[in-house]
């Protein structure tokens, strides 16, 4: 149930993360599944255990198996499971597909492809990159960050990425790649400033005190995939993850969905027992690209008792 | 992200039992952790009454052990305090929470629940 | 069960100053490395809200204003600069063994 697969290239580093980590801090010990042999925290051995991670430095084909992680606490223990295949390195150009992070799909507006698991590991820009095996080299390319961006993508673009970069441990330094494939979306897609569906600018909604609401934060920003394209919802100016009140969330995630062609991006605000001092906030949707930021603001009236009444005697 | 609704009576008579709902939604409550019952006498003081974990196993606090059973509907992502034979020392506001390794991270809303004949 | 005594109960505190709450537990909640004991903030008509785990981890989101240190038996959760927003009650619990306790409180008030 708590099991990760992982894998790596013989004489490359492997770094593991315990698939039940949560919250660092947190004491955690490596076992050999097999052996049920504990797994050393120091830094001399080949393979180590620090926190959270399992460090293969560098790895090799006969560490293949399952590793066992325990996060432990007095009252909760919480055991993971890391699947390590190591391989032999390809003696050819060819990436079998068992060494594959998964796929990514981009347009001529989105061509971000990221680096696979390079979070676990100590390194330094600039990433090397190559497509099925040649360097990138161009003004097409640019390595940014953990992430290479393609600009003016073409069909031909399509095909096997692998980043390469360094791991530092101790001022020992160690190889490691990752390969995934880049598949091009082929779409005529264009990107505007963004325009507010819902709701209305300065709109009133009416609630009842008591009951729960939602507000829909609704924008269109263009046509097919979008480089960069948000939604979301802010109270009295302030962003919903400041303003500490449980009651009100805004969900997580936001919904794509395609209107006549348009990327439309909406988010719902939940707001959970209405009270009194809902309707003194300013509720601001906000919609954000590349092009800039547009604001509609919607405030909450309380709903005229009159409209439970039955009109008729 | 885990959010938690409460649900249940805010008047109960002594000597019956006392019975709350709790509905996760954004998170399985097999998948993993543990899913507690807290009360908040009047007077503030906290008292964590118990959990059902993923798995679940049920641990509770011993000073309720004879009185207390959490127990869950995994078809609905629902888990439920029942606390037998209740006096007006149970007067509280009950609140469930997740605890993900040993604090409470995610919290319902809480029920004001009162003891009385 | 180990119980957790806060002090003071309440304290008043001016903007910008230091705020400094203890919490005593009558036991050692410290083993491994690890001291489990953890700090949250409650508002009236709201749940308490995590903001320090393990002594002295900030729960994400929180700000740095606040921080937690101690171990053993003794832990402190100090607020500094206090912010307006930051009147509330506080409470410290553990989780060494069960039953998980929590202390009595400490309410925070602005001057």
């Known amino acids: 149930k708590f099991s990760k697969q992982s894998w790596g290239l013989e004489n490359e580093a492997l770094i593991v993360r315990c698939p039940r980590q949560g919250k660092s801090s947190y004491i955690v010990d490596w076992y050999y599944s097999q052996t049920n042999k504990s797994i050393p925290t120091q830094e001399r051995n080949r393979v180590f255990a620090s926190g959270q991670l399992l460090k293969f430095l560098p790895a090799e084909v006969a560490d293949s198996g399952i590793y066992t992680c325990i996060v432990r606490s007095p009252t909760f223990n919480r055991t993971g499971y890391a699947n390590v295949t190591i391989y032999k390195k390809q003696p050819d150009c060819n990436v079998p597909d068992y060494l594959m992070y998964s796929t990514v799909s981009g347009s001529e507006k989105n061509s971000k492809i990221y680096c696979p698991t390079i979070d676990l590991y100590n390194w330094t820009a600039p990433l090397e990159w190559f497509k099925n095996c040649q360097a990138l080299q161009g003004s097409r390319y640019k390595a940014h960050k953990s992430f290479l961006v393609i600009d003016n993508v073409m069909t031909d673009d399509a095909g096997d990425y692998t980043c390469k970069f360094i791991h530092n441990e101790n001022g020992a330094n160690y190889s490691v790649t990752a390969t995934r494939s880049f598949t091009v979306k082929d779409e005529q897609g264009f990107s505007r400033f963004p325009v507010i569906r819902a709701p209305a600018h300065n709109e009133t909604k009416e609630v009842e005190i008591g009951e729960n609401t939602n507000l829909t934060c609704s924008a269109c920003f263009g046509k097919g995939a979008q480089f960069l394209a948000t939604v979301q919802w802010q109270l009295n100016g302030n962003k919903i993850t400041d303003f500490s009140e449980p009651r009100i969330q805004q969900e997580e995630g936001q919904n794509q969905s395609f209107s006549n062609g348009l990327a439309c991006v909406n988010t719902v605000l939940r707001i959970a027992d209405v009270k009194e001092e809902d309707l003194l906030l300013r509720y601001d949707c906000l919609a954000l690209n590349l092009h800039g930021l547009r604001r509609h603001t919607i405030r909450l009236s309380r709903k005229n008792p009159i409209d439970h009444q039955s009109t008729y005697c | 992200d885990v959010q938690l609704q409460q649900s249940g009576p805010g008047l109960v008579k002594p000597s019956q039992s006392l019975s709350l709902t709790c509905t996760v939604t954004g998170y399985s409550i097999t998948s993993d952790y543990a899913w507690d019952w807290i009360r908040q006498f009047p007077g503030n003081k906290l008292e964590w009454m118990g959990y059902i974990r993923y798995s679940g196993d049920t641990y509770y606090n011993p000073s309720l052990k004879s009185r207390i059973s959490i127990t869950r509907d995994t078809s609905k992502n629902q888990f439920f305090l029942q606390l037998n034979s209740v006096t007006t020392e149970d007067t509280a506001t009950y609140y469930c929470a997740t605890t993900m390794m040993d604090t409470m991270d995610y919290w319902g809303q809480g029920t004001s629940v009162t003891v009385s004949s | 069960d180990i119980v957790l005594t806060q002090s003071p109960a309440s304290l008043t505190v001016s903007l910008g100053q230091r705020a400094t709450i203890s919490c005593r537990a009558s036991?050692?909640?410290?083993?491994?490395?690890?001291?489990?004991m953890h700090w949250y903030q409650q508002k009236p008509g709201q749940p308490p809200k995590l903001l320090i785990y393990l002594a002295s981890n900030l729960e994400s989101g929180v700000p740095a204003r606040f921080s937690g240190s101690g171990s053993g038996t003794d832990f402190t959760l100090n607020i500094h600069p206090v912010e307006e927003e930051d009147a509330a009650t506080y409470y410290c619990?553990?989780?060494?063994?069960?039953?998980?306790?929590f202390g009595a409180g400490t309410k925070l008030e602005l001057k």
């Open positions: 036991k050692s909640v410290s083993t491994s490395g690890n001291s489990y």
């Open positions: 619990q553990h989780s060494r063994e069960f039953p998980l306790t």
